[in-house]
Interface confidence: medium
């Protein structure tokens, strides 16, 4: 099939990085500056993506591949191929139309992006709250109250960092 196609279509001989110039008897010409063709046999080159404003260049455009963008500090990518940049918020916040807002009580966000999500309801799994939630962190669920033997503590104290009476080396 390829051989037949080549005989019928001179453009199939044009490699990636070039285009088949119909203005010149289908001579292959290199892509103009700021354009690319990622496959052979193309009749036009595609315009390179330009990473401007809040976008910054992660990978430069070449004659055979498009530029790739990411976002400037304080922003993060959204959408396929980083089609949008969205403002970062602090942990414990979410982005609203009015800007970054603290998570409401009972919700948290441990990232700089995304929305505040409700704390886990430990009781739905028959467990108890081992560590309370904050705006930045979900609650930590522990064993169910019935699993705890009388007098047992639900929190194990940490081991001492060093033996008492010894100075650090």
């Amino acid at each position: 099939f390829e051989r037949t196609r080549s005989l019928q279509d001179p453009c199939s001989n044009c490699p990636a990085g070039t285009f088949c110039d119909n203005n010149r008897n289908q001579i292959c010409s290199p892509c103009p500056p700021n354009s690319f063709s990622s496959a052979g046999g193309q009749r036009t080159c595609d315009i390179c993506r330009q990473c401007k404003g809040v976008f910054r260049t992660r990978k430069e455009c070449s004659s055979t591949s498009n530029a790739e963008c990411d976002c400037t500090p304080g922003f993060h990518c959204l959408g396929a191929g980083c089609s949008m940049c969205e403002q970062d918020c602090k942990q414990g916040q979410e982005l609203t139309k009015k800007g970054c807002k603290d998570c409401c009580f009972g919700t948290f966000n441990d990232q700089k992006r995304g929305i505040c999500r409700p704390w886990t309801n430990c009781s739905l799994d028959g467990k108890s709250v081992l560590v309370n939630g904050t705006k930045e962190r979900d609650v930590v669920c522990g064993p169910s109250p019935a699993d705890l033997s009388p007098g047992a503590s639900s929190v194990t104290p940490p081991a001492p960092a060093r033996e008492p009476g010894h100075s650090p080396q």
Epitope: P15, T18, N23, R24, I27, C28, P30
Partner: antibody
Framework: QVQLQESGPGLVKPSETLSLNCTVS????????WSWIRQPAGKGLEWIGR???????NYNPSLKSRVTMSVDTSKNQFSLKLTSVTAADTAVYYC??????????????WGQGTMVTVSS | DIQMTQSPSSVSASVGDRVTITCRAS??????LAWFQQIPGKAPKLLIY???GLQSGVPSRFSGSGSGTDFTLTISSLQPEDFATYYC?????????FGPGTKVDIK
């Protein structure tokens, strides 16, 4: 700035193969077509053919059966082989950069040329 | 193949003269024409691309015009370093072909 330098034997025996290299310095060989042109003494210029950095070639039909071009991007070099040479192939051989789109296949940078004589 | 012809084949001129060289293609080549200057013993040098585009670093006394089959290279005021042979070349279709050249020498 980009410079081209042809290299190869100045004397080739009839019926043998002429082999020339062109080294590109001061810039990348990538994303251009590269041509070979020859000029017999006191005569005009003849385009031999061109090669793209991917290895894609176009040859002058008058020489096609005898010409092979290749490219070595790692060495920033491209080469010409012309088989079954005769005295009519005696000429100055030039390599040239071809196909920077801005110049629409005009040869904007040339080597200084190398004289090849076909004689026994 | 597209045949390129040039006229005159040679011209004698003096410094300061206006010199015009014509190039004709055997079939239409749109604007896919370049002009080169060659000094004896040197490689050709690109002067004009796509019929009228002045190559970077080339003095503005050189200009090109034309499209289709008829093209012109003009040197508005000939300088001593301009005495050379001038070639036109088409890149409209394979094989790329050159004109036979026009020699500009001192009158």
């Amino acid at each position: 700035q980009v410079q081209l330098q042809e290299s190869g034997p100045g004397l080739v025996k009839p019926s043998e193969t002429l082999s020339l290299n062109c080294t590109v310095s001061g810039g990348s060989i990538s994303n251009y077509y590269w041509s070979w042109i020859r000029q017999p003494a006191g005569k005009g210029l003849e385009w031999i053919g061109r090669i793209y950095t991917s290895g894609n070639t176009n040859y002058n039909p008058s020489l096609k059966s005898r010409v092979t071009m290749s490219v070595d991007t790692s060495k920033n070099q491209f080469s010409l082989k012309l088989t079954s040479v005769t005295a009519a192939d005696t000429a100055v051989y030039y390599c040239a950069r071809d196909g920077n789109w801005n110049y629409a296949d005009a040869f904007d940078i040339w080597g200084q040329g190398t004289m090849v004589t076909v004689s026994s | 193949d597209i045949q390129m012809t040039q006229s005159p084949s040679s011209v004698s001129a003096s410094v300061g003269d206006r010199v015009t060289i014509t190039c004709r293609a055997s079939q239409g080549i749109s604007s896919w024409l370049a002009w080169f200057q060659q000094i004896p013993g040197k490689a050709p040098k690109l002067l004009i691309y796509t019929a009228s585009g002045l190559q970077s670093g080339v003095p503005s006394r050189f200009s090109g015009s034309g499209s289709g089959t008829d093209f012109t290279l003009t040197i508005s005021s000939l300088q001593p370093e301009d005495f050379a042979t001038y070639y036109c070349q088409q890149t409209n279709s394979f094989p790329f072909t050159f004109g036979p050249g026009t020699k500009v020498d001192i009158k």
